[in-house]
Interface confidence: low
């Protein structure tokens, strides 16, 4: 018969014959022959291969370098890479999470719309009318102005996006 020019899924063509690929988590030791099947070996500890493959070396698990503020979010297996994330207070600089930067703080007049995670930075929003923030913070939302009326007081000084209103006693009419 004619030698094949294409092979089935999970096979590869070598020396005019179709050999089985190694399954995820295993690497190629030797190609198949007319008489023998493909020889595969499991990846070692701290190594992985995540596809059907003919690789002769497994990939090293990603190293979550603590010197860069990284820690392991999900430990790698023989079929999956390690997933890194950042220590508390920091977030990844890229999707690959190869290093970390400090979470941004929201300035006075701005509040936290969304608290940062290990992979995304703080999202800030301007405090709308009726709300204020007087601190630079990565956690604080805009606070509503104090309601003087509910305390039976009146507004003595109007609030801004950075300051609360100042309440004071109502002027009593003298008899």
């Amino acid at each position: 018969p004619e030698p094949p020019t294409a092979c089935r899924e999970k096979q590869y063509l070598i020396n005019s014959q179709c050999c089985s690929l190694c399954q995820p988590g295993q690497k190629l030791v030797s190609d198949c022959t007319e008489f023998t099947e493909t020889e595969c070996l499991p990846c070692g500890e701290s190594e992985f291969l995540d596809t059907w493959n003919r690789e002769t070396h497994c990939h090293q698990h990603k190293y979550c370098d603590p010197n860069l503020g990284l820690r392991v979010q999900q430990k790698g297996t023989s079929e999956t890479d390690t997933i890194c994330t950042c220590e508390e207070g920091w977030h990844c600089t890229s999707e690959a999470c190869e290093s970390c930067v400090l979470h941004r703080s929201c300035s006075p007049g701005f509040g936290v719309k969304q608290i940062a995670t290990g992979v995304s930075d703080t999202i800030c929003e301007p405090c709308p009318v009726g709300f204020f923030s007087n601190v630079s913070s990565a956690f604080e939302k805009c606070h509503p102005w104090t309601s003087c009326e509910t305390k039976d007081l009146v507004v003595q000084q109007a609030g801004t996006n950075k300051t609360d209103v100042v309440c004071g006693p109502q002027d009593r009419l003298r008899a």
């Epitope: 090293q60 603590p66 010197n67 860069l68 503020g69 220590e87 207070g89 290093s99 930067v101």
Partner: antibody, heavy 119, light 107 residues
Framework: QVQLVQSGPGLVKPSETLSLTCTVS????????WSWIRQPPGKGLEWIGH???????NYNPSLKSRVTISEDTSKKQFSLKLDSVTAADTAVYYC?????????????WGQGTLVTVSS | EIVMTQSPATLSLSPGERATLSCRAS??????LAWYQQKPGQAPRLLIY???NRAADIPARFSGSGSGTDFTLTISSLEPEDFAVYYC?????????FGQGTKVEIK
């Protein structure tokens, strides 16, 4: 410029605990990682372990069971404790620091402390 | 752990000569390699990081090259103050490990 000044005894008895302290000046103790490295007389360098800005520690597996590294941010200090010492622990001990995220190595070094283990 | 092997152990050269120091890793460390200089009675000093980047205040006569498992530190023209011991260090895998050092001595 960050400077590291080491303090601690130069002589420790076998089976006792070696304790050294490193004081940071000229910069914040935060957002750096701080390591201890040792060098036996006439030999090469061996990394002992480190503590990161968040307080998380990592130790060399060969010493892990005997080592504790801690920090006191209020005093801008970090410390090394090595338990159950033997003559093989005789070495110059260095504290060293690096910037988190700088992806470099050990940027700053203490002056070194020769610790002799002997009765 | 990754074993770092430096060669030669000793290099005997004269001032003005070119020094070539070698460092080999037992497995790939990408470009995550640093070089340090240590003089007698002093702490090591960072010379090169990420295999080829000079640290602050390091003269241009020092250069690093290599990637994977083979690295070189070159001192283009030795000055009297360059005679010292040089160490390579990888930070690609845990734990960080150092080579045993190359002593550059005056011939």
């Amino acid at each position: 410029q960050v400077q590291l000044v080491q303090s601690g005894p130069g002589l420790v008895k076998p089976s006792e605990t070696l304790s050294l302290t490193c004081t940071v000046s000229g910069g914040s103790i935060s957002y750096y990682y701080w390591s201890w490295i040792r060098q036996p007389p006439g030999k090469g360098l061996e990394w002992i372990g480190h503590i990161s800005y968040s307080g998380s520690t990592n130790y060399n597996p060969s010493l892990k069971s005997r080592v504790t590294i801690s920090e006191d941010t209020s005093k801008k200090q970090f410390s090394l404790k090595l338990d159950s010492v033997t003559a093989a622990d005789t070495a110059v001990y260095y504290c060293a620091g690096g910037i988190v995220g700088a992806r470099r190595g050990f940027d700053f070094w203490g002056q070194g402390t020769l610790v002799t283990v002997s009765s | 752990e990754i074993v770092m092997t430096q060669s030669p152990a000793t290099l005997s050269l004269s001032p003005g000569e070119r020094a070539t120091l070698s460092c080999r890793a037992s497995q790939s460390v990408s470009n995550n390699l640093a070089w340090y200089q240590q003089k007698p009675g002093q702490a090591p000093r960072l010379l090169i990081y990420d295999a080829s980047n000079r640290a602050a205040d390091i003269p241009a006569r020092f250069s690093g090259s290599g990637s994977g498992t083979d690295f070189t530190l070159t001192i283009s023209s030795l000055e009297p103050e360059d005679f010292a011991v040089y160490y390579c260090q990888q930070r690609n895998n845990w734990p960080p490990t150092f080579g045993q050092g190359t002593k550059v001595e005056i011939k």
